[in-house]
């Protein structure tokens, strides 16, 4: 089994308020087994944006079809962006367990929000 890498290709993404933001994340291996989660921010104050094993997350949809058994694309789209959504988003692989434990994080994608065009 190859070592898991988490690829967040975009260092930054800029989106106009009211639009949708696509945050890209691909993994290179299904192992270790466990869910993908997205967070805004780091450390104890980070905010859960999406968790593969639970939901729903009304403003968040996955870009690819995560029900495919071999899926390794966990990019997400966040709708109706507001200035409060600005921040750095991390795609994180968890290892299954009770509870699941954080295994590896992507480098992060900084989302900036532009004013809505008049």
């Amino acid at each position: 089994e190859e070592e898991l890498q988490i690829i967040q290709p975009d260092k930054s993404v800029s989106v106009a308020a009211g639009e949708s933001a696509i945050l890209h994340c691909t993994i290179t291996s299904l192992f270790p087994v466990g869910p993908i989660q997205w967070f805004r921010g780091a450390g104890p104050a980070r905010v859960l944006i999406y968790n593969q094993r639970q939901g729903p997350f009304p403003r968040v949809t996955t870009v690819s079809e995560t029900t495919k058994r071999e899926n390794m694309d966990f990019s997400i789209s966040i709708s109706n962006i507001t200035p409060a959504d600005a921040g750095t988003y991390y795609c994180i692989k968890f290892r299954k367990g009770s509870p699941d434990t954080e295994f590896k994080s992507g480098a992060g994608t900084e989302l900036s929000v532009r004013a809505k065009p008049s």
Epitope: L30, F31, P32, V33, P35, Q52, R53, E65, T66, T67, K68, R69, E70, K96, S98
Partner: antibody
Framework: DVQLVESGGAVVRPGETLRLSCTAS????????MSWVRQAPGKGLEWVSG????????YYADSVKGRSTISRDNSKNTLYLRMSSLTAEDTAVYYC???????????WGLGTLVTLSS | ALTQPASVSANPGETVKITCSGG?????YGWYQQKSPGSAPVTLI????KRPSDIPSRFSGSASGSTATLTITGVQAEDEAVYYC???????????FGAGTTLTVL
Amino acid sequence: DVQLVESGGAVVRPGETLRLSCTASGFTFSSYAMSWVRQAPGKGLEWVSGISASGSDTYYADSVKGRSTISRDNSKNTLYLRMSSLTAEDTAVYYCARETWNHLFDYWGLGTLVTLSS
Amino acid sequence: ALTQPASVSANPGETVKITCSGGGTSSYYGWYQQKSPGSAPVTLIHSDDKRPSDIPSRFSGSASGSTATLTITGVQAEDEAVYYCGGYDYTTYVNTFGAGTTLTVL
């Protein structure tokens, strides 16, 4: 409430073809992967086939590979299993089941009986 | 293949543990109850330890390494059934089941 109702079971002769259906209600069918699981008389459960939410990707047990086709019509909330070249070993109750995020099962239908008789 | 005991028995009120092994660390496990042959299975546990909201709290699941365990705390007469463990293997994209464990409540 989630409901899965199978139909199409019948008494058939060896070598014939049969199509089973499973009609779903109570959830957003197009968002979930689905599977068929069977149980031969006096035996345990055997996974037969699975399909991704859009229907683009399909998966089969070795015991049916090459002579079975799983498909779905999301506009009709219906899952199908077409089985050809049937043999006595295919005699079983066939259940459709909804998959969880990690391809286990959370809801099951009541089953439909397929009997091979020469 | 997943391995589980063929049968277990217990008195009402006792705690029963049914084990399932052989899935490896690349598997998730689920537990399914079937009260009579040919009747619809009911999911008790999925994702190793997740219990659907309509399942009584006396049923719990756990997994360590390549072994999963279903625990029934305070077994009741109505729990008499066959219990199947099931697994999904990320290396093969295939679901497998154990042969089933018959629980007899004495």
